[in-house]
Amino acid sequence: ALDTNYCFSSTEKNCCVRQLYIDFRKDLGWKWIHEPKGYHANFCLGPCPYIWSLDTQYSKVLALYNQHNPGASAAPCCVPQALEPLPIVYYVGRKPKVEQLSNMIVRSCKCS
Amino acid sequence: ALDTNYCFSSTEKNCCVRQLYIDFRKDLGWKWIHEPKGYHANFCLGPCPYIWSLDTQYSKVLALYNQHNPGASAAPCCVPQALEPLPIVYYVGRKPKVEQLSNMIVRSCKCS
């Protein structure tokens, strides 16, 4: 799987999950989240050569098409597969609230 | 929805489904499919600005991050959302067979 275990410990050039830290205030302009100040969101990057963790029958056909038509703009793209939630603390008035923000952290990628 | 109804009738520059015809023999090197000779597979293409048919909470965060960090390589990507099957006819010996190939045609796209 193109997950953090594999991708963070290798020099993989193809589609893989990459490290990305997002600071809520600096990067998103969000002041309302009290904790954490930021988080390891990660992101997906890298080419999707034939056959690299392809998602569907369509992506296999498209990758094959791309190999035979290298100049084509139609190609599979490296996108998140498994996402995890992020617990945050924010305030409503003076009252702290704990919330799970779903689908916030990328754990693995796929070619779609 | 970024589907064929909308995308094929507009000059949309952002993520949208685009027309792509694949000829089985010329583009894939497949001689074994008797009918059809090719099909309208379509593909997804275009930038994913904030907020353009974003898939998950993560893709919203990433698009926002991208707005604040325009030079970053981390950005959502335009990929298939709804896929449809393709019926084909091929031969096993002299006997024609009809098969539905699943997930072969892109009907709509999303930013993931």
Epitope: K60, L64 | G29, W30, Y90, V92, K97
Partner: nanobody, 114 residues
Framework: QVQLVESGGGLVQPGGSLRLSCAAS????????MGWFRQAPGKQREMVAI??????SYVDSVKGRFTISRDNAKNTLALQMNSLKPEDTAVYFC?????????WGPGTQVTVSS
Amino acid sequence: QVQLVESGGGLVQPGGSLRLSCAASGSIFGVFYMGWFRQAPGKQREMVAISTDDRTSYVDSVKGRFTISRDNAKNTLALQMNSLKPEDTAVYFCNLNQLGTDYWGPGTQVTVSS
């Protein structure tokens, strides 16, 4: 059900050659592609070469050194590997995609070392 069996792997010196073969048995029809893939220790499985009915494709690192060939009458696939390098060391797998379903052989080890 399709079965695949590879043969021809072994130990070879840098610059040497090997020929891998793959025999396919079962009901072979509706073949999207047949191909050779390899997996080095701690790496993802990667494509080496694939063949459709009248087309072949190679990963950049083997172009000009490896040749894939297919005999449809005998349901066999071969990979001629010349000018082998230490970085070609891996387990090599034969693959057949039939109507969208992937079938794999058990693999054959290729080691390039002096």
